[in-house]
Structures are given as structure tokens and as C-alpha cells.
């Protein structure tokens, strides 16, 4: 099974405590990624004023970032475990190109950006083992991802800062919603 970052042998079977359940292990792993995102957001906010920008201005950006909706079966109303798990895995796979884009966007937090990217790959593997309906999971086309990456990297400085901020914010929101949903499984 994939090794979850932030987890050492004592987490799995510490003396005088119960071993972590699968749900708690996934939770711990997602929290590790969220901590990484927090650190990256700090650096982004410190070097630009993107974090103060209004939501309306941000919404004008034409990034097609994965977002959870009611139809995905991840909310308490209309919760559907199989549909939701497919949405979470598909969404994480779609975020991978954006996490690749982030790799050259940080100076002091370069290692943190790499850790977020690698941990997400491990999370995807971990969740794929849990999924019953793997055929329903659509993997983005490598050529589409490559051209998207080129397009993002060709933006001016202001747009690149805005894109970085939006990716981090959206990824945080997607993971937090995933956390809520995964706890119901």
C-alpha cells in the first residue's frame, strides 16, 4: 500500500492506542497536503496582493479548475459513495497539471510545492484502491495537459500570480470538501 506522508510507524500501531482506521489514515494524509497548501498560500499572499482580490474579480479568470457540485454525490443531501469517490479521484487527476504548474512558482517553499504534488499522487493511488468503479474515472489527456501547461506558463506575471492563488485556493476547497465526503464512506 502507498506510504502516506506525515505518517510514521507509530501512527499505524502505537503502543496504548488503536491502529488508525483507513478513514483516519486518508484524513491524516489530506491534512498533510492541506498544511502544505497553507504554507504555499502564505508565500503567495506575502509576495502579491492576490489574496485581497474580490471573489468576483477572481471568478473572471477562465481557469477550468475542478469543483464539487451537488450532482457529484459528495454532499450530505444525495450522498452517493461510488459517484462521489469517482468525482474525488477524477478531480485530483485533473488538478495534477495545475500542481505541475506550481512547481516553478515558489522560491522559499520549493520543497513544499514538490511535497504537495507527490502526496497528491500517493492520495490518488490510495483512493483508487478504494474505488469499485475504476472504469468511470477519466484521466486527462497528456497532450491536453501539456498544451495547458504551456499556455499557463506563457501568461504575464500578474496573471501567473493570479493563477497560482486560484489553484491553491481551489485545491484547498476541493480537498476540504473531499474530506467531508470521505468521512461518510
Amino acid at each position: 500500500a502507498p506510504v502516506l506522508p506525515g505518517e510514521d510507524s507509530k501512527d499505524v500501531a502505537a503502543p496504548h492506542s488503536q491502529p488508525l482506521t483507513s478513514s483516519e489514515r486518508i484524513d491524516k494524509h489530506i491534512r498533510y497536503i492541506l498544511d502544505g497548501i497553507s504554507a504555499l498560500r502564505k508565500e503567495t499572499c506575502n509576495r502579491s496582493n492576490m489574496c485581497e482580490s474580490s471573489k468576483e474579480a477572481l471568478a473572471e479568470n477562465n481557469l477550468n479548475l475542478p469543483k464539487m457540485a451537488e450532482k457529484d454525490g459528495c454532499f450530505q443531501s444525495g450522498f452517493n459513495e461510488d459517484t462521489c469517490l469517482v468525482k474525488i479521484i477524477t478531480g485530483l487527476l485533473e488538478f495534477e497539471v495545475y500542481l505541475e504548474y506550481l512547481q516553478n512558482r515558489f522560491e522559499s517553499s520549493e520543497e513544499q510545492a514538490r511535497a504537495v504534488q507527490m502526496s497528491t499522487k500517493v492520495l490518488i493511488q490510495f483512493l483508487q484502491k478504494k474505488a469499485k468503479n475504476l472504469d468511470a474515472i477519466t484521466t486527462p489527456e497528456p497532450t491536453t495537459n501539456a498544451s495547458l501547461l504551456t499556455k499557463l506558463q506563457a501568461q504575464n506575471q500578474w496573471l501567473q500570480d493570479m493563477t497560482t492563488h486560484l489553484i491553491l485556493r481551489s485545491f484547498k476547497e476541493f480537498l476540504q470538501s473531499s474530506l467531508r465526503a470521505l468521512r461518510q464512506m
Epitope: S23, D27, R31, M68, F75, Q76, E173, Q176, R180
Partner: antibody, heavy 120, light 106 residues
């Protein structure tokens, strides 16, 4: 000043409806995770519902599921609790509160509460 | 809903005593637990979050521990201001509370 102010409480007959409002100031509800908690007279705290700002995802306690609806109006920076088919056991002080934006979250801001009395 | 069972429901103690309140979750909740103090007629205030992190401004005599299903709140040396009701709350799924522990003067 960062605060939450509840309103809309009062006396209502069993089977009736009431809508509570919670006006937020000093922060925006559009990027915060909000919660309603109630406390029956002389009893403990009971979580009622919460609303995660992302896509407006709501969760409800089993005791109110299907009867209560939590919603928000971002333009008014206000959260609501629509309470239908009220019962005597819904009598309580209703607190509006904010979950801290962290993982795991905790309640870092409370309103002063509004009293709802369900009685004939 | 996740059930939170708090014990004892009432605790009689004296100033200077060390007291411990326990909270048990009906399923594993990792460290998604907070402790609150409530005084009559007032809204609760957070003491401990993430199971063991002390809220800023809260005296260091308060401490929290535990993970998974078993949690404790300890007050190392009771002060007159500490006589109140204490609640644990999980935020793993929803936000259910324990039934409360009333700490009273012996």
C-alpha cells in the same frame, strides 16, 4: 468588529415555522464555514447544522433533518435557519457560530443566541 | 450522527485540585475534537482545539490529550474562575457535543 448577531426567535405553536437570521460583521460568510448550535433550557449544547462555504454544502443533525434548512445570502452577509414542523423539544436558545478555517476546525466565534419557544 | 459520551456529568472539586474530564467518541475522529467552557447565561468559549492545542489567552493549567476515540481535558490546579460547565465537540462529521460536565465547588 468581528461579530455574529442572531434574530428571529420567539414563541411559536407546535407544527409552526420560524426563520432565524444571523448577521455577520467584520468578516465575509462567503469564505467561512458557519454552524448553528442550540441549547434547551438547563440542558447541554446540541449541534443543529452547518454550512460549508464551498458550494453551500449543508449538514444536519438527525434530530432536525428534513425539518430545518440552513442557507445564506452572501449579499447581506447573513446566514439563515428555516425551521418547519416545530416541536416542543425544539425549544432552546439558538446560537449562530463560525467554524475556524482550519483542519480540524473548532468554533472560534459565537453569537449571543436567540430564544425559540415552541408551546401551545 | 457521531455520539460523544462525556464523563463524569458532575464533578465536585476544590481550588487547587487536579481534575480530569473524559470524552469518548462512538467512532474514530482522529484529532478532530475541541473543548469549551460555558458559564451560565453566556455563549461557550473554546479552550482546546485539535484535541491538544491551547487556545490563545487560555491559562496553561488547561491541557488536552487523546486521539481516535478517547480524549481528556485536564485542569492541573483548579482556580475559582474554573467552576463552570465543560463540553467536548467533534468536528469529524457534523459537530456533535458531549452532554457536558458541570464542575462545582466541593
Amino acid at each position: 468588529e468581528v461579530q455574529l448577531v442572531e434574530s428571529g426567535g420567539g414563541l411559536v405553536q407546535p407544527g409552526g415555522s420560524l426563520r432565524l437570521s444571523c448577521a455577520a460583521s467584520g468578516f465575509t460568510i462567503s469564505s467561512n464555514y458557519m454552524i448553528w448550535v442550540r441549547q434547551a433550557p438547563g440542558k447541554g449544547l446540541e449541534w443543529v447544522s452547518d454550512l460549508y462555504y464551498y458550494a453551500g454544502d449543508t449538514y444536519y443533525a438527525d434530530s432536525v433533518k428534513g425539518r430545518f434548512t440552513m442557507s445564506r445570502d452572501i449579499s447581506k452577509n447573513t446566514v439563515y435557519l428555516q425551521m418547519n414542523s416545530l416541536r416542543a423539544e425544539d425549544t432552546a436558545v439558538y446560537y449562530c457560530a463560525r467554524w475556524a478555517d482550519d483542519h480540524p476546525p473548532w468554533i472560534d466565534l459565537w453569537g449571543r443566541g436567540t430564544l425559540v419557544t415552541v408551546s401551545s | 450522527d457521531i455520539q460523544m459520551t462525556q464523563s463524569p456529568s458532575t464533578l465536585s472539586a476544590s481550588v487547587g485540585d487536579r481534575v480530569t474530564i473524559t470524552c469518548r467518541a462512538s467512532q474514530g475522529i482522529s484529532s478532530w475534537l475541541a473543548w469549551y467552557q460555558q458559564k451560565p447565561g453566556k455563549a461557550p468559549k473554546v479552550l482546546i482545539y485539535k484535541a491538544s492545542t491551547l487556545e490563545s489567552g487560555v491559562p496553561s493549567r488547561f491541557s488536552g490529550s487523546g486521539s481516535g476515540t478517547e480524549f481528556t481535558l485536564t485542569i492541573s490546579s483548579l482556580q475559582p474562575d474554573d467552576f463552570a460547565t465543560y463540553y467536548c465537540q467533534q468536528s469529524w462529521l457534523g459537530g456533535s457535543f458531549g452532554q457536558g460536565t458541570k464542575l462545582e465547588i466541593k
